[in-house]
C-alpha cells in the first residue's frame, strides 16, 4: 500500500488551531513538476457534505512529502469530508477523513467501519441532543432509510446493512428530520472486495494474518498497518510517537500523538494513534489495552507487562505476542519483512534461526507462494544462530506474494512470512525527445513514460549513426537531467534509444524504441566586412560587403543584414538568399534615424560571425508637398509656375526643387533649384516652342520633401530651339521682376 497518512488535529476548542496534514513516505512524493511523482493534494470534498461558504482554506507545503491545510474560521468549516491524494500512476491513492461536529444532534459511535464483502455492517448514531422526530439515513448524500424516533435503542439509532458489497462503500449520515445537515452523524463505510482473510482478483489468495489491528488489502494482500505498527504483518511496534510504514514519521508537539486522528489508505480508514482512544483521541488506554483506539488486549503471559503503545513486553527467556513462546523453541531471527527482486533474476535468500537444540541446515526450509519448498544449498553455523542460504530459481511474476521461512527442531517450530515483490524492469514506451541540435551535438530529454516498475535508478542513452553497423555508443545519465551527445558528425542522422534501469540486480530493462535525430549543418566561419554604403533617399540605403578569399567551396546559403535602431530599441533583419550577392538595397527605413549596421553569413539555421558594425545616419524626411501648383505659358520659350507653400511645416524651407520633363520624352528630367524659399512663383525660361512640358516640385528643409501634383503646359508659337530651360522667380502677389 502507498505510505500515505492524513493527520487531523482534534483539539477543537478553537477552530483556528485545527489543521489537517497529509504526510507521504513515498520516495519522491509530491515533487510535482518532476516526471516521476505528481504532487500531494489535500482538499475539502464538498460533493456529499456541503457546508456554508467561508474564506478559502490555506494550503502550505512543507518540503516534498508534506502538505497542511489551515484557515478554518468557525466550527462548521470543519464538518465534512477531507481527502488527501498521493502516490504516482497506478499507485495513486486517496485517503479520506470524515469530521463530525462535537455539538451535533447525533454522533457516530464509531466513524470508520471496515467490513468484509458479505458481512453485516451496523452503523450506530448516538443521540447527543434529542429531537422527537424521524431520523433520516443517507448514503453518499442520497436518501437511504427512515427511522421513527421511537426506534432508538439505548439512545442509539442503528442502521443494519446485511450482506454488504463493495458498491455499498461510502459516506453515510444520520440526521434528524428538519435539522441542519451540520448536526448529522457522519460515517465512512469501507467494504473490502473479498470475504474475511482473502484477497486477489477472485479472492483466491490467503491474507498474511495481519496483527495488531492491521487490515489486509483486498487488491495486493499487503497489511495496512495501524499507526504505530510496522512489518509485513504489522508485527512490530514503533517507538512511542512514531508512525508511517517504516516508523519514519514523528507526531508533532510535546504530547506525541495525543489528540490526533490518523487516516490511512483503504481498507484501513481512520483511528487514533497507538495508545490513544476516544472521539477526540485524548484518552490514554485503560490498563491491559493497547494499540490504535486501544482496541487490542495484551493478555500477557509468563510475567510480561502491558505497554499501551506496543503490547506485551516480555521478560528474558520469553517472546511472542503474549510472551507465550520460550526462547528454547526455535526462532527465526531478523527476517526482513519485505524483499524486492527483479524479474528473471536468481537471487539468494538467507534465513537465520536460533534455538535449543540448535537448528541445522536441513531443519530450515523456504516455501514459495505456490507451495513449492526450497531446501538450502549451504548453511553458516555461528555460536548464536544458523543461517541457511537458498538459491532461488529464476523468478517469474507469479512468485510475488508471501514466502515463508520455517524452522523445525525437536524443541518445536517457528515460521516467519515475508513479502517478496517481483518487479518488472522498466521499458520505455516512447523514444527520447530532441531538445536542441548543433552541427556536432544533440541535446536530448531522456525522460519518457515507461512500462514496468520504478523507481528509475539510471538512464542509458544508446546512439550511433543511422544505417551504421558499428557498435552503439552509450552514455549513462541522471534520470532527471537532459543529455548532451557530443563529438558527432555534422549533417548526420543518428539513431537514439533509451534504456532504463531500476535498483537491484537484473534491473536493466529492454531498450526503448529508436528515434532519428539529425545534427545541424556546419557553422559558417567566414566573417564578412562592410565595403561601403550610400543613402539613396530618406528611407533607402544601398549596402555592399566583401568576404575573405579562402580555398574550397563557400559554406553558406546567404547573408543576413541587421540594422539596429538604438533609439527605438528595434532591429530590422534583411535576408539575402544568395551566397554570391555582395550588395543589397534596404528600403522602408525610418528617415532621420541613426542605425548600426552589420552583415553575417548563414548556413541552414546557423549564423556565422558578424562583420564589424557600421554607423549610418539617414537624412530626415522632408516637408509636405507644395499645394495648388499651376503652369501658365508666357511665350514660345517661357512658362510661369505658381504654387502655395506646404502646410504644417516642421521647420523653415531652405529651397524648392522644380522637375521639368518633356511630355512623352524619354530623357532624364531636369531639376531646377528655387533658392528663395519665400517665393510662390517662378518663370522657367529657355523652353522649346510648341512643346508640351510636365512640371512638379517639392520643398527641402533638411531633406527633400514630397512631390507636388504634376501639371502640364505647352509653350506658345513656333520659335527657335532654345538652349534649355532656366528659371526666374518672382513674388506672384506683387507681380515684380526679381
Amino acid at each position: 500500500a502507498v505510505d500515505l497518512t492524513l493527520l487531523a488535529n482534534l483539539r477543537l476548542t478553537d477552530p483556528q488551531r485545527f489543521f489537517l496534514t497529509c504526510v507521504s513516505g513515498e520516495a519522491g512524493a509530491g515533487r510535482g513538476s518532476d516526471a516521476w511523482g505528481p504532487p500531494l493534494l489535500l482538499e475539502k470534498d464538498d460533493r456529499i457534505v456541503r457546508t456554508p461558504p467561508g474564506p478559502p482554506l490555506r494550503l502550505a507545503r512543507n518540503g516534498s512529502h508534506q502538505v497542511t491545510l489551515r484557515g478554518f474560521s468557525k466550527p462548521s468549516d470543519l464538518v465534512g469530508v477531507f481527502s488527501c491524494v498521493g502516490g504516482a500512476g497506478a499507485r495513486r491513492t486517496r485517503v479520506i477523513y470524515v469530521h463530525n461536529s462535537p455539538g451535533a444532534h447525533l454522533l457516530p459511535d464509531k466513524v470508520t467501519h471496515t467490513v468484509n464483502k458479505g458481512d453485516t455492517a451496523v452503523l450506530s448514531a448516538r443521540v447527543h441532543k434529542e429531537k422527537q422526530t424521524d431520523v433520516i439515513w443517507k448514503s453518499n448524500g442520497s436518501y437511504f432509510y427512515t427511522l421513527d424516533w421511537h426506534e432508538a435503542q439505548d439512545g442509539r439509532f442503528l442502521l443494519q446493512l446485511p450482506n454488504v458489497q463493495p458498491p455499498s462503500s461510502g459516506i453515510y449520515s444520520a440526521t434528524y428530520l428538519e435539522a441542519s445537515p451540520l448536526g448529522s452523524a457522519f460515517f465512512r463505510l469501507i467494504v473490502r472486495g473479498c470475504g474475511a482473510g482473502r484477497w486477489g482478483p477472485g479472492c483466491t489468495k490467503e491474507c498474511p494474518g495481519c496483527l495488531h489491528g492491521g487490515v489486509c488489502h483486498d487488491h495486493d494482500g499487503e497489511c495496512v498497518c495501524p499507526p504505530g505498527f510496522t512489518g509485513t504483518r504489522c508485527e512490530q511496534a514503533c517507538r512511542e510517537g512514531r508512525f508511517g510504514q517504516s516508523c519514519q514519521e514523528q507526531c508533532p508537539g510535546i504530547s506525541g500523538c495525543r489528540g490526533l486522528t490518523f487516516c490511512l489508505p483503504d481498507p484501513y480508514g481512520c483511528s487514533c494513534g497507538s495508545g490513544w482512544r476516544g472521539s477526540q483521541c485524548q484518552e490514554a488506554c485503560a490498563p491491559g489495552h493497547f494499540g490504535a483506539d486501544c482496541r487490542l488486549q495484551c493478555q500477557c503471559q509468563n510475567g510480561g507487562t502491558c505497554d499501551r503503545f506496543s503490547g506485551c513486553v516480555c521478560p528474558s527467556g520469553w517472546h511472542g505476542v503474549h510472551c507465550e513462546k520460550s526462547d528454547r523453541i526455535p526462532q527465526i531471527l531478523n527476517m526482513a519483512s519485505e524483499l524486492e527482486f527483479n524479474l528473471e533474476t536468481m537471487p539468494r535468500i538467507n534465513c537465520a534461526a536460533a534455538g535449543n537444540p540448535f537448528p541445522v541446515r536441513g531443519s530450515i526450509e523456504l516455501r514459495k507462494p505456490d507451495g513449492t519448498v526450497l531446501l538450502s544449498t549451504k548453511a553458516i553455523v555461528e555460536p548464536e544462530k544458523t543461517t541457511a542460504e537458498f538459491e532461488v530459481p529464476r523468478l517469474v511474476l507469479a512468485d510475488s506474494g508471501f514466502w515463508e521461512c520455517r524452522v523445525s527442531t525437536s524443541g518445536g517450530q517457528d515460521s516467519r512470512r515475508f513479502k517478496v515483490n517481483v518487479k518488472v524492469p522498466p521499458v520505455p514506451l516512447a523514444a527520447p525527445r530532441l531538445l536542441t541540435k548543433q552541427s556536432r551535438q544533440l541535446v536530448v530529454s531522456p525522460l519518457v513514460s515507461f512500462s514496468g516498475d520504478g523507481p528509475i535508478s539510471t538512464v542509458r542513452l544508446h546512439y550511433r549513426p543511422q544505417d551504421s553497423t558499428m557498435d552503439w555508443s552509450t552514455i549513462v545519465v541522471d534520470p532527471s537531467e537532459n543529455v548532451t551527445l557530443m563529438n558527432l558528425r555534422p549533417k548526420t542522422g543518428y539513431s537514439v534509444r533509451v534504456q532504463l534501469s531500476r535498483p537491484g540486480e537484473g534491473g536493466e530493462g529492454a531498450w526503448g524504441p529508436p528515434t532519428l535525430m539529425t545534427t545541424d549543418c556546419p557553422e559558417p566561419l567566414l566573417q564578412p566586412w562592410l565595403e561601403g554604403w550610400h543613402v539613396e533617399g530618406t528611407d533607402r540605403l544601398r549596402v555592399s560587403w566583401s568576404l575573405p578569399l579562402v580555398p574550397g567551396p563557400l559554406v553558406g546559403d546567404g547573408f543576413l543584414l541587421r540594422l539596429w535602431d538604438g533609439t527605438r530599441g528595434q532591429e530590422r533583419r534583411e535576408n539575402v538568399s544568395s551566397p554570391q550577392a555582395r550588395t543589397a538595397l534596404l528600403t522602408g527605413l525610418t528617415p532621420g534615424t541613426h542605425y548600426q549596421l552589420d552583415v553575417q553569413l548563414y548556413h541552414c539555421t546557423l549564423l556565422g560571425p558578424a562583420s564589424p558594425p557600421a554607423h549610418v545616419l539617414l537624412p530626415p524626411s522632408g516637408p509636405p508637398a507644395p499645394r495648388h501648383l499651376h503652369a501658365q505659358a508666357l511665350s514660345d520659350s517661357e512658362i510661369q509656375l505658381t504654387w502655395k507653400h506646404p502646410e504644417a511645416l516642421p521647420g523653415p524651407i531652405s529651397k524648392y526643387v522644380v522637375e521639368v520633363q518633356v511630355a512623352g520624352g524619354a530623357g532624364d528630367p531636369l531639376w531646377i533649384d528655387v533658392d528663395r524659399p519665400e517665393e510662390t512663383s517662378t518663370i522657367i525660361r529657355g523652353l522649346n516652342a510648341s512643346t508640351r512640358y510636365l512640371f512638379r516640385m517639392r520643398a527641402s528643409i533638411q531633406g527633400l520633401g514630397d512631390w507636388s501634383n504634376t501639371v502640364e503646359e505647352s509653350t506658345l508659337g513656333n520659335g527657335l530651339q532654345a538652349e534649355g530651360p532656366v528659371q526666374e522667380s518672382r513674388a506672384a502677389e506683387e507681380g515684380l521682376d526679381q
Epitope: 432509510y145 427512515t146 421513527d148
Partner: antibody, heavy 119, light 110 residues
Framework: EVQLLESGGGLVQPGGSLRLSCAAS????????MSWVRQAPGKGLEWVSS????????YYADSVKGRFTISRDNSKNTLYLQMNSLRAEDTATYYC????????????WGQGTLVTVSS | QSALTQPASVSGSPGQSITISCTGT?????????VSWYQQHPGKAPKLMIY???NRPSGISNRFSGSKSGNTASLTISGLQAEDEADYYC??????????FGGGTKLTVL
C-alpha cells in the same frame, strides 16, 4: 415509474373485517414510510395510518386506533391495512400513498379502492 | 387530530388570481416546513401540487405557488384556467408523526 395499486375493497357488514393490500413497484419499497389515506363519499381527505420501513414504527388516526392494523411485507413490496370492527363511517375510498424520502409529504398515490360498510 | 381549516369554496374568472388559505396550529403548520397542497379532480386520486410550503414538483405549472406565515399556509393560482377547476387540499406533517388534512376547497372557474 412509481406505481401503487390498491386492492381488497368491497361491501362488508358493520362489525365485519376487511384486509386491503397495496402492491408497490418502480422504487425501493423497503426504505420508504408508507401511509393509508381515505376519503368518504363527497367528503375530504383523512389520514388513516403510517408505517416506517422496518415496520417498527406504526401510527394511527384516533378514529381508527385499536380497530385497524397497518403492516408491510418488504420482500413482497406490499403494504396492508387490516380493518376490524368496521363501522358505517369507515365507508370511503382508501388510498395507499408513499411518503417522500427525508420529507413530510406524500408524493405518490394509488388510484384507491372503495370500502362500503353497510347492512 | 382536528382538520386544518380551509374555505369551503372559492371562485374566479379565467386569467384572474385566487388564493386558498389553510389555518392550523403550532403543532402542525407552525412547527414544520412540511406543508403540501393536493389537487383532486372528481373520481381521481389526489395529485401533489406544492410541497414543503413553496416547492413545485417537476411538471407543475409555475402558476401555482405556496407560502406560509405563522400557523397559516396559502396556495395561490394565477392566470386561472378552466382545467384548474377541482378540489384542493392542504396537508401538514405533525409533531406526533401523523398527517392532518384540510377539509378541502372547491375551486370554480366562472
Amino acid at each position: 415509474e412509481v406505481q401503487l395499486l390498491e386492492s381488497g375493497g368491497g361491501l362488508v357488514q358493520p362489525g365485519g373485517s376487511l384486509r386491503l393490500s397495496c402492491a408497490a413497484s418502480g422504487f425501493t419499497f423497503s426504505v420508504y414510510v408508507m401511509s393509508w389515506v381515505r376519503q368518504a363519499p363527497g367528503k375530504g381527505l383523512e389520514w388513516v395510518s403510517s408505517i416506517y420501513p422496518s415496520g417498527g414504527g406504526t401510527y394511527y388516526a384516533d378514529s381508527v386506533k385499536g380497530r385497524f392494523t397497518i403492516s408491510r411485507d418488504n420482500s413482497k413490496n406490499t403494504l396492508y391495512l387490516q380493518m376490524n370492527s368496521l363501522r358505517a363511517e369507515d365507508t370511503a375510498t382508501y388510498y395507499c400513498a408513499r411518503r417522500k424520502a427525508a420529507a413530510g409529504y406524500l408524493d405518490y398515490w394509488g388510484q384507491g379502492t372503495l370500502v362500503t360498510v353497510s347492512s | 387530530q382536528s382538520a386544518l381549516t380551509q374555505p369551503a369554496s372559492v371562485s374566479g374568472s379565467p386569467g384572474q388570481s385566487i388564493t386558498i388559505s389553510c389555518t392550523g396550529t403550532s403543532s402542525d403548520i407552525g412547527a414544520y416546513k412540511h406543508v403540501s397542497w393536493y389537487q383532486q379532480h372528481p373520481g381521481k386520486a389526489p395529485k401533489l401540487m406544492i410541497y414543503e410550503v413553496t416547492n413545485r414538483p417537476s411538471g407543475i405549472s409555475n402558476r401555482f405557488s405556496g407560502s406560509k406565515s405563522g400557523n397559516t399556509a396559502s396556495l395561490t393560482i394565477s392566470g386561472l384556467q378552466a382545467e384548474d377547476e377541482a378540489d384542493y387540499y392542504c396537508s401538514s406533517y405533525t409533531s406526533r408523526n401523523t398527517w392532518v388534512f384540510g377539509g378541502g376547497t372547491k375551486l370554480t372557474v366562472l
